[in-house]
């Protein structure tokens, strides 16, 4: 859909990973003066939400409150702007935003090889494992928008595991992992306990780096 206006932006506050029963704000905004914003969840016929746009300093926006979070609220969202109502003249869609519900199943374990403290430039691998038969593991880094996803390997010693090679360490961070099942890509487990990875002998040991995106800028198209 091309739209009569360029696409608005869609952000999740505080982020796109939402604990069960908690609320997330999806903010649709644009520098086009839209009078109306619509929020649509992919594949849903009934649940398109409509809000009147607010205008401040050349920006129009609408804050859609989604929650308390349940399985049927998770999914891929897009927002649209319109300067008219009945009929709407919709803009191009925002980039898609995957909203994930977490806290549904038992937490996996997260560990680091060779260990959570590594020398700068040394390779580090994070391993996520669980006795639950998760098909997929997701690794998130605090303050970063993009999760990484790996398929769980075959059962070994009673656990299902995925390894995330981080490559040569440059600066540390706090990591968490989640498990999910193939048939429910938007429904994730409880978070693992956080794992702090520290890099020693590195001048830029501060984290996150100033160029990294914040957790509210949306997340990638990788759930399907």
């Amino acid at each position: 859909h091309e739209g009569v206006h360029r696409k608005p932006s869609l952000l999740a506050h505080p982020g796109p990973l939402v604990k069960s029963e908690e609320t997330v704000i999806l903010q649709c905004w644009s520098d086009v003066r839209f009078q109306h914003f619509l929020l649509h969840r992919e594949g849903k016929f009934k649940d398109t939400l409509h809000l009147i746009g607010e205008h401040h300093d050349g920006v129009s926006k609408a804050n859609f409150s989604i929650g308390p979070m349940m399985q049927d609220l998770a999914g891929t969202y897009r927002c649209y702007g319109s300067v008219t109502h009945s009929p709407y003249q919709l803009s191009a869609p925002s980039d898609p935003l995957d909203i994930v519900i977490t806290g549904l199943y038992e937490k996996p374990s997260l560990s680091a090889q060779p260990g959570p403290t590594v020398l700068a430039g040394e390779s580090v691998t994070l391993s996520c494992s669980s006795r639950s038969s998760y098909d997929m593991y997701h690794l998130s880094r605090e303050g970063e928008a993009h999760e990484r996803r790996f398929s769980a390997g075959p059962k070994v010693n009673g656990t299902f595991q995925a390894d995330f090679p981080l490559g040569p360490a440059t600066h540390g961070g706090t990591y968490r992992c989640f498990g999910s099942f193939r048939d429910s890509p938007y429904e994730w487990s409880n978070s693992s306990d956080p794992l702090l990875v520290s890099v020693t002998g590195n001048p830029s040991n501060s984290w996150p780096s100033p160029t990294e995106p914040s957790s509210e800028t949306g997340n990638p198209r990788h759930l399907h």
Epitope: H40, E42, F45, L49, P87, L90
Partner: antibody, heavy 120, light 111 residues
Framework: EVQLVQSGAEVKKPGSSVKVSCKAS????????ISWVRQAPGQGLEWMGG????????NYAQKFQGRVTITADESTSTAYMELSSLRSEDTAVYYC?????????????WGRGTLVTVSS | QSVLTQPPSASGTPGQRVTISCSGS????????VNWYRQLPGTAPKLLIY???QRPSGVPDRFSGSKSGTSASLAISGLQSEDEADYYC???????????FGGGTKVTVLA
């Protein structure tokens, strides 16, 4: 003025398929939701499913899942409902109805209906 | 068997008030708004009440809707002969993921 113009009456054999069209005028077709509702002779209304052309989203009532296909052609402002594996119980008047994007299930305009008769 | 339950018929004399009930469950009326449609013989249905109690423009204020819990009702006051029609309630059902209708109520205006 909004109008939903439906295709003409059809007589079909059991086991065959029927495709009913609904051409919209007087509005931005793609920015609305189109539903299909049927009514068997002397019976009540039954929602079959709907489509929002701009979102490419089609939803089907569980009863018709796998047997009905709802599509839309934005270039001609026309929605279609195809029902397969017809049986005598599918003899009914088939209506298309329009809703706003954010009130997709509030049917504010209706077509006049298309009578589909299934008979051997 | 319709998901929403309506009485099959209702009647009254001109000028009277007639009320039609529509009973559902927590997955439809209990958690979603109710719309009412009126169907004159041989014609397509027409929206009469939306969002429980709102009238589209052109619908006289003799028609009113209400909702409480898992039930809704439509009231017609000052009944007129042209009100003879079938009346249907409808709501979204979260469990069925679709629109459900009542079986319809035939309103007769007695001479």
């Amino acid at each position: 003025e909004v109008q939903l113009v439906q295709s003409g009456a059809e007589v079909k054999k059991p086991g065959s398929s029927v495709k009913v069209s609904c051409k919209a005028s007087g509005g931005t077709f793609s920015s609305y939701a189109i539903s299909w509702v049927r009514q068997a002779p002397g019976q009540g209304l039954e929602w079959m499913g709907g489509i929002i052309p701009i979102f490419g989203t089609a939803n089907y009532a569980q009863k018709f899942q796998g047997r009905v296909t709802i599509t839309a052609d934005e270039s001609t402002s026309t929605a279609y409902m195809e029902l397969s594996s017809l049986r005598s119980e599918d003899t009914a008047v088939y209506y298309c109805a329009r809703g706003e994007l954010d009130t997709a299930i509030r049917f504010d305009y209706w077509g006049r209906g298309t009578l589909v008769t299934v008979s051997s | 068997q319709s998901v929403l339950t309506q009485p099959p018929s209702a009647s009254g004399t001109p000028g009277q008030r007639v009320t039609i009930s529509c009973s559902g469950s927590s997955s439809n009326i209990g958690s979603n708004t109710v719309n009412w449609y009126r169907q004159l013989p041989g014609t397509a249905p027409k929206l009469l009440i939306y969002s429980n109690n709102q009238r589209p423009s052109g619908v006289p204020d003799r028609f009113s809707g209400s909702k409480s819990g898992t039930s809704a009702s439509l009231a017609i006051s000052g009944l007129q002969s042209e009100d003879e029609a079938d009346y249907y309630c409808a709501a979204w059902d979260d469990s069925l993921n679709g629109v459900v209708f009542g079986g319809g109520t035939k309103v007769t205006v007695l001479a």
